[in-house]
């Protein structure tokens, strides 16, 4: 039986300040059951960037249609990028539980922010 893969195809993405950044993530299976979340950074101090069910993330939108059935594309778009957004972003699959348990992380995508062209 194949193990679930969390695929972040780009190692790095460079975006001009003020533009939007697209961070790609796909999974190879709909199971195990459980949500996907996006974080900036790794370890206990990581910052939650997007979680569909909880929190308010006004600058972050899913790339795929939120009513799409059996979606395996969990890419996100972050609008109005600033230098403070630079860092490595991880797409993380959780196994459903009480609480949910981290199962597998993508390899990460490093976001660098270029100065806005004058």
């Amino acid at each position: 039986e194949e193990e679930l893969q969390v695929i972040q195809p780009e190692k790095s993405v460079s975006v001009a300040a003020g533009d939007s950044a697209t961070l790609n993530c796909t999974v190879s299976s709909l199971i195990p059951v459980g949500p996907i979340q996006w974080f900036r950074g790794a370890g206990p101090g990581r910052e939650l960037i997007y979680n569909l069910k909880e929190g308010h993330f006004p600058r972050v939108t899913p790339v795929s249609d939120p009513t799409k059935r059996n979606n395996m594309d969990f890419s996100i778009r972050i609008s109005n990028i600033t230098p403070a957004d630079a860092g490595t972003y991880y797409c993380v699959k959780f196994r459903k539980g009480s609480p949910d348990v981290e199962l597998k992380s993508g390899a990460g995508t490093e976001l660098s922010v270029r100065a806005k062209p004058s």
Epitope: E1, L30, P32, V33, P35, K53, K68, R69, N71, F74
Partner: antibody, heavy 120, light 108 residues
Framework: DVQLVESGGGVVRPGESLRLSCAAS????????MSWVRQAPGEGLEWVST??????YYADSVKGRFTISRDNSKNTLYLQMNSLRAEDTAVYYC???????????????WGLGTLVTVSS | EIVLTQSPATLSVSPGERVTFSCRAS??????IAWYQQKPGQAPRLLIY???SRDTGIPDRFSGSGSGTDFTLTISSLQSEDFGVYYC??????????FGGGTKVEIK
Amino acid sequence: DVQLVESGGGVVRPGESLRLSCAASGFSFSIYAMSWVRQAPGEGLEWVSTIGADDTYYADSVKGRFTISRDNSKNTLYLQMNSLRAEDTAVYYCAKDSTVGWSGDFFDYWGLGTLVTVSS
Amino acid sequence: EIVLTQSPATLSVSPGERVTFSCRASQNVRSDIAWYQQKPGQAPRLLIYAASSRDTGIPDRFSGSGSGTDFTLTISSLQSEDFGVYYCQQYYDWPPFTFGGGTKVEIK
């Protein structure tokens, strides 16, 4: 076309066991969660159990007595039911889970069901 | 556990009439509601998911609406083949998945 065919139902006495099977075809069985939902005679729908990969979830009413499993090489879902009680009498439906958005499962295809009767 | 309350329990309707079913959740379930139709002796059939998205092949006389705790299934013009029981289901917070008690539609 998606097809789900349940088998294994029948009449048993309280305390006995039964194993239900659900043969699936027409979709990539191994990447979908699968569930059992039951319906007591003349009553509404009650979720019983769901399996993802090796992750399993149960209703409190069956926890510790029922075990859900799957064999992806045979495209088959199972429900092992032990210590059966009169209140387990129902039609048991096998259902294919579907997800929408980033979370949440509902049931987009159902089998015709198999009747389990627990009676002394 | 999230409790879903459906009303009314039974509806007696003439073909061609507009029919509205209600499903109320005991807490916020966002838009994570599905609707099913079950005819006597048959398995349930998915009609609507994500509160308002019609499943493939479902006639456009069926529509769903609502978010949070209050949801509605509407049949714009009831056909004779629409008799049966209609169930809502929440999948926002599980286990357990929970279903409403159902609304039975009888043809007048």
